[in-house]
């Protein structure tokens, strides 16, 4: 399927909303920064079949949606922006699911790249563990917000590469 331009725009909108969600100065949180080990190689569009790449994108956005759908997240962010952000992610998930259904019959490769999906899940587990260890402090959420912006940027770039492949 043609990963629509609207999907990339949706990702950009999600990034802008996430940028607006900042509540405290990130410069007060420099000591809290953490290397979560973003699995950058999973966003290299060249190594995957298209369906596999879409499944990685879907997992990334699903995990982001899950992270920001928790009670702890609701307490951390301004409700209106959080709802807009979640809606944007939900719309992207729907787009990707429609894409996967369309693609399945067109490729003989397996639908899922299990190693890549697992790498993404472990990445989000590290983020959740960090938040737990930091007791969901404002600085911990600020660090995670920056990290999710980074991961969404990577997924935007993967989408661009997939579109160029078409």
């Amino acid at each position: 399927c043609d990963l629509p331009q609207t999907h990339s725009l949706g990702n950009r909108r999600a990034l802008i909303l996430l940028a607006q969600m900042g509540r405290i100065s990130p410069f007060s949180c420099l000591k809290d920064r953490h290397d979560f080990g973003l699995p950058q190689e999973e966003f290299d569009g060249n190594q995957f079949q298209k369906t596999q790449a879409i499944s990685v994108l879907h997992e990334m956005i699903q995990q982001t949606f899950n992270l920001f759908s928790t009670e702890d997240s609701s307490a951390a962010w301004e409700q209106r922006l959080l709802e807009k952000f979640s809606t944007e992610l939900y719309q992207q998930l729907n787009n990707l699911e429609a894409c996967v259904i369309q693609e399945v019959g067109m490729e003989e490769t397996p639908l899922m790249n299990e190693d890549s999906i697992l790498a993404v899940r472990k990445y989000f587990q590290r983020i959740t563990l960090y938040l737990t260890e930091k007791k969901y402090s404002p600085c911990a959420w600020e660090v995670v917000r920056a990290e999710i912006m980074r991961s969404l940027s990577f997924s935007t770039n993967l989408q661009k590469r997939l579109r160029r492949k078409d």
Partner: antibody, heavy 120, light 111 residues
Framework: QVQLQESGTVLARPGASVKMSCKAS????????MHWVKQRPGQGLEWIGV????????TYNQKFKDKAKLTAVTSANTAYMELSSLTNEDSAVYFC?????????????WGQGTTVTVSS | DIVLTQSPASLAVSLGQRATISCRAS??????????MHWYQQKPGQTPKLLIY???NLESGVPARFSGSGSGTDFTLNIHPVEEEDAATYYC?????????FGSGTKLEIK
Amino acid sequence: QVQLQESGTVLARPGASVKMSCKASGYSFTTYWMHWVKQRPGQGLEWIGVIYPGNGDTTYNQKFKDKAKLTAVTSANTAYMELSSLTNEDSAVYFCTRNYKYDYYTMDYWGQGTTVTVSS
Amino acid sequence: DIVLTQSPASLAVSLGQRATISCRASKSVSTSGHSYMHWYQQKPGQTPKLLIYLASNLESGVPARFSGSGSGTDFTLNIHPVEEEDAATYYCQHSGELPFTFGSGTKLEIK
């Protein structure tokens, strides 16, 4: 493509104030921090401070907190820096630079620089 | 403030050889897996250009002959093989804590 266009050369008297501008294009101005950096002739680089145009949040190098004031006008996609109580020490090239990689705080795109000369 | 000491202040390297520039921080700039040290190149009359971020990550579009290493307080920029166009002043910059500071620069001349 990303561009940062700074105002031209400024000649000012000691004790005066100057306000320089940095017009951004090619990216979402409100969602990137903007740093300001000073470079004296033949010398190194000094970090002055940073502004988030989206909400006007600023953080300064303590050394410059009484010298520089950072502002931004989102409707014009422009960041500003005002320097007050000028002395010869303020004669330098001033760069605006876009923050890069979120909380890594590196600088990817740089304006061409505004040259400030303080002379009586 | 964290002081970044670059050495040497200047060096001359023959075409095709290796240039090694050191940057020592007065305090560690590494935390939880990342080293917040970055390298820039500035040619005469030009603006600085980001080469390396987080000590060892090559910025997009920068030739692979540039590499960075180090952690804690000691960092190195290597250029190999050196080319004519690499004649410039190189600065390290940390973002470990406020205020961010730059090294005093190392001027590279190509012989």
